[in-house]
């Protein structure tokens, strides 16, 4: 599998409509919780919790502060922690407790505490429960949590130093935790947790399961350096621990290795960054998407692998176990266990078969079973990804978070759209297209290029958004910027399953927002722009420049996958310095203007989509160079002369008979043509027009070719 290409389009922060929320002097907006029925987004930040309108997060509805007392800060600082940063209260758990309350935990100056937040009064109840085992002491330590039927399941560290990892269930009637033993958890970095419900009509009377995802130091592979391993672990919701062996401990804790590698190159992604569980009516079993980086990531590699949950369950239900054996110098080695396995199966949830054998609860399980799972929590079998390969591998980027949406294109094809955030504040939107990855777009969510810490996807029909949290605030982005594609070709070439061209309105529309989704709309996920209707009109610009001056002709082709070149009087321009230059890699500079430079200039783009090449006329300029006698008095047109040598620009609309896409012979001018190779970096501000004219109509000429004004964005 090849590396994913660069994003086709890069949207700068200012180019698209993004809604932002941040409060002065509040940082670390890392906990997000969406209440779809209330259209409210709850935001947990440092020392504060906010409720904002989920449809417009800039509208704050409520706020509550949970600050650390000066006394607590001082005690924390005495232990060597920073009073300004670490000895504060970082909200780490923000979970629904009931229809009217949230369960909130914070680091609380290295004395983790939890409380109930009343959503009516938006005040804390002042319970001040001990948050140990539910929330980390250190804001820098990893954590994950999920609320299941009023009980909090957490993965975090249990002590001040962060040296005792724990996966626990906070429950009044049956609290459980992991054994503090290396085979169970070995310096884990917790990533994600979620509950997977069993269908009520499940034939085996199975239990709901809670899955935990983390990276830990390997016990089974030992090299000179510590090898990190991505893990999937699971516990059963009905687990009550053992009566004697594994008392108050999980009897159902099993873990397995997650495989995400590129088989052909030996490239192994072994650091888990984030996980998203995709549930969809069309999916019998949930699919989880996991985001990885390699352990030694000096080149900025990231990968996404997708897994069927049934694959993981198969490993836990029928897979072989690993066992530790002591070899020379009391060195421990982990190998496959091939001996007899006690019954009931160690680590299994209590199902109808177990109940039939009178094992109605884990408290009744025989000590042989419990002792076995205590000593063998690690499975020998690994969980392999769908198709045995990553869905996406990207170079030169560090992905941080992932959410996935399953959507249906106009032709009925179902696409899993991956929204992946980066450590530079961007969001990539990607899909798999016929075993290749297409990164539809990159959106710069945060101006300061700060890492995205949290990503959340709304699942409500209609207005759907991605919410991203960072150190400085939260950004709300729509799932697609369809309206930014100004032409049918642009709309089709975007290959965005959310977008389709509407000929009646001549706009690119979001599918889920249209009344009758398929009527007359054009969407071609193959990128075949020939389906677009013919147009006979195009816009062009007429410029008047003075003799000897310099002209800049603009060309704002948004596609990073397109090659841009210029034609003058239907001949491809050669890079004959000092006559021509490129500004911002797309705009044409013409130096030392003379009458011979007058004429028609066209900016063309060439984009390969599958095995087809799509040509477009992006911009057309008519240039007229005039000899201007030196005026005796100050010129009356000085207001228009904004660029020194430019006298005036006017926009004309005309029929464009005779213009056609360049032939391959003309296009093949690799030696001398001024071309623009695909651009990996986000488009800079150098493409910004000097004179902005917003009234230019978007009109088409022939198929797979259109003319548009240079300042179209």
């Amino acid at each position: 599998m090849a590396f994913a290409p660069i994003p086709r389009i890069t949207w700068e922060h200012r180019e698209v409509h993004l809604v932002q929320f941040h409060e002065p002097d509040i940082y670390n907006y890392s906990a997000l919780l969406l209440s779809e029925d209330k259209d409210t987004l709850y935001i947990g930040a440092r020392e504060a919790v906010f409720a904002v309108n989920a449809l417009n997060i800039s509208e704050k509805q409520h706020e509550v502060y949970w600050k650390v007392s000066e006394d607590k800060k001082a005690k924390c600082a005495e232990k060597g922690k920073s009073k300004q940063t670490e000895c504060l209260n970082y909200i780490r758990v923000l979970q629904p407790l009931s229809a009217t309350s949230l369960y909130v935990c914070g680091t609380n100056a290295f004395q983790p505490a939890c409380d109930h937040l009343n959503l009516t009064s938006f005040k804390f109840l002042g319970k001040n429960e001990d948050g140990k085992g539910r929330c980390p002491f250190d804001p820098a330590h990893s954590y994950t949590s999920v609320m299941v039927d009023g009980e909090l399941y957490s993965g975090t560290s249990y002590n001040f130093l962060g040296s005792e990892p724990i996966i626990s269930r906070n429950s009044s009637h049956s609290p459980l935790r992991t054994e503090y033993a290396i085979p169970w958890l070995n310096e884990p970095s917790f990533v994600f947790a979620d509950v997977i419900r069993k269908s009520p009509d499940s034939p085996d009377g199975e239990d709901d399961r809670v899955y935990f995802f983390f990276t830990e130091v390997s016990v089974e592979y030992e090299f000179v350096f510590r090898v990190l391993i991505p893990r999937i672990a699971r516990v059963c919701k009905g687990d009550q621990g053992g009566l004697r062996t594994l008392q108050k401990k999980w009897t159902s804790f099993l873990k397995a290795r997650l495989i995400c590698s590129r088989p052909d190159s030996g490239l192994v992604f072994n650091v888990l960054r984030d996980v998203f569980v995709l549930r969809s009516p069309g999916l019998k079993v949930p699919v989880f998407y996991a985001l990885f980086t390699p352990q030694l990531n000096n080149v900025g590699l990231s990968a996404v692998c997708a897994y069927n949950l049934s694959t993981a369950e198969e490993v836990f239900s029928h897979g072989k176990y690993m066992q530790s054996t002591t070899v020379e110098q009391s060195h421990t080695k982990w190998v496959r266990y091939n001996g007899p396995v006690p019954k009931p199966r160690p680590g299994a949830c209590i199902d109808s078969e177990a109940r039939a054998a009178n094992y109605t609860s884990s408290l009744n399980l025989p000590d042989k079973t419990l002792q076995f799972v205590k000593d063998h929590p690690l499975m020998d079998d690994s969980v392999t990804p769908i198709d045995n390969r990553p869905r996406l591998i990207k170079k030169d980027v560090n992905y941080t978070q992932i959410v996935v949406d399953r959507t249906q294109a106009l032709d009925g094809t179902v696409y899993d759209v991956m929204f992946v955030s980066t450590d530079r504040g961007a969001l990539h939107k990607a899909i798999s297209l016929e075993h290749a990855v297409h990164i539809i777009e990159e959106t710069q969510l945060f101006q300061d290029f700060e890492p995205v810490q949290t990503l959340l996807l709304s699942s409500k029909k209609g207005n759907r958004f991605v919410y991203a949290g960072s150190n400085s605030g939260v950004v709300q982005a729509p799932l697609a910027f369809c309206g930014k594609h100004g032409t049918c070709e642009d709309c089709v070439l975007a290959r965005d399953p959310y977008c389709a061209w509407s000929p009646p309105t001549a706009t690119c529309v979001a599918l889920h927002q249209t009344e009758s989704p398929s009527r007359g709309l054009i969407q071609e996920m193959s990128g075949d722009a020939s389906v677009c209707p013919d147009k006979s009109k195009g816009s062009y610009r007429q410029h008047f420049f003075k003799h000897g001056g310099t002209a800049e002709l603009k060309c704002s082709q948004k596609s990073n996958l397109a090659r841009v070149f210029w034609k003058f009087q239907n001949g491809v321009l050669k890079a004959e310095s000092p006559k021509y230059g490129l500004m911002g890699r797309k705009n044409l500079l013409i130096f030392n203007l003379s009458e011979g430079d007058s004429g028609v200039y066209q900016c063309l783009s060439e984009e390969r989509v599958k095995n087809k090449t799509v040509f477009q006329v992006v911009a057309k300029h008519v240039l007229e160079v005039k000899v201007v006698p030196k005026p005796v008095v100050a010129p009356t047109l000085s207001v228009v002369q904004t660029e020194g040598s430019r006298i005036a620009t006017k926009v004309l609309v005309a029929s464009t008979q005779g213009s056609s896409p360049p032939t391959p012979a003309v296009q093949a001018t690799s030696s001398g043509a001024i071309t623009l190779p695909p651009k990996p970096a986000p488009t800079g501000t150098s493409c910004e027009p000097k004179i902005v004219i917003n009234t230019v109509p978007q009109l088409h000429s022939e198929k797979t070719m259109y003319l548009k004004s240079s300042d179209n964005r």
């Epitope: 009550q240 009566l243 009178n358 025989p366």
Partner: antibody, heavy 122, light 108 residues
Framework: QVTLRESGPALVKPTQTLTLTCTFS??????????VTWIRQPPGKALEWLAL???????YYSTSLKTRLTISKDTSKNQVVLTMTNMDPVDTATYYC??????????????WGQGTLVTVSS | SYELTQPPSVSVSPGQTASITCSGD??????VYWYQQKPGQSPVLVIY???KRKSGIPERFSGSNSGNTATLTISGTQAMDEADYYC???????????FGTGTKVTVL
């Protein structure tokens, strides 16, 4: 109705082996989760746990007395036998047997015998 | 070996609250059971699994377990509550049950 009755010698000599039998009714030691345990209490002192045997024939012993204790069961007779070797006067105590409820019932020492006083003296 | 320490005695006036503690290392990792023993009788379970009251036991008996200490609370103590009370737990590292040292509750 569950009942347990301890039986054995009231007097044993030092260095001798004590054999105690717990005969029970109202439950079966083949039922999942059930166990029978032995506890003793020297006169005027605290309770001390000795040993346990469960339905799955798992056996546990007090670490301080492990080398001297043996527990066994005869499910057909509804009996549990505890033997204690090398008796000493400090082993003088009331010896109780008790039923341990299944885990899902709470796993506690649910029903106790009335106890049998064993005196170790020469 | 693992030890559970209880105060030797607790005195309480009728109607008042008696609290009996049971201390042991990381006791909240274990289930604590409380037994009541009256003179000349076999022990009877009062509280199991930290805080669950056995059926037939009056509501005035309650239990808790946090950190290194478990507590049996008798609110509105009555004369009939005068007895010896023992805490008990399973010690998993040595696979054995351990009883506390016992507390004599006297109702004044």
């Amino acid at each position: 109705q569950v009942t347990l009755r301890e039986s054995g010698p009231a007097l044993v000599k030092p260095t001798q082996t004590l054999t105690l039998t717990c005969t029970f009714s109202g439950f079966s030691l083949t039922t999942t989760g059930v166990a029978v345990t032995w506890i003793r209490q020297p006169p005027g002192k605290a309770l001390e746990w000795l040993a346990l045997i469960d339905w799955d024939d798992d056996k546990y012993y007090s670490t301080s007395l492990k080398t001297r204790l043996t527990i066994s069961k005869d499910t057909s007779k509804n009996q549990v036998v505890l033997t204690m070797t090398n008796m000493d006067p400090v082993d003088t105590a009331t010896y109780y047997c008790a039923r341990i409820a299944s885990g899902d019932s709470g796993g506690y020492f649910a029903d106790w015998g009335q106890g049998t006083l064993v005196t170790v003296s020469s | 070996s693992y030890e559970l320490t209880q105060p030797p005695s607790v005195s309480v006036s009728p109607g008042q609250t008696a609290s009996i503690t049971c201390s042991g290392d990381k006791l909240d990792d274990k289930y604590v059971y409380w037994y009541q023993q009256k003179p000349g009788q076999s022990p009877v379970l009062v509280i199991y699994m930290d805080n669950k009251r056995k059926s037939g036991i009056p509501e005035r008996f309650s239990g808790s377990n946090s950190g290194n200490t478990a507590t049996l609370t008798i609110s509105g103590t009555q004369a009939m509550d005068e007895a010896d009370y023992y805490c008990q737990a399973w010690e998993s590292s040595s696979d054995q049950y351990v009883f506390g040292t016992g507390t004599k509750v006297t109702v004044l």
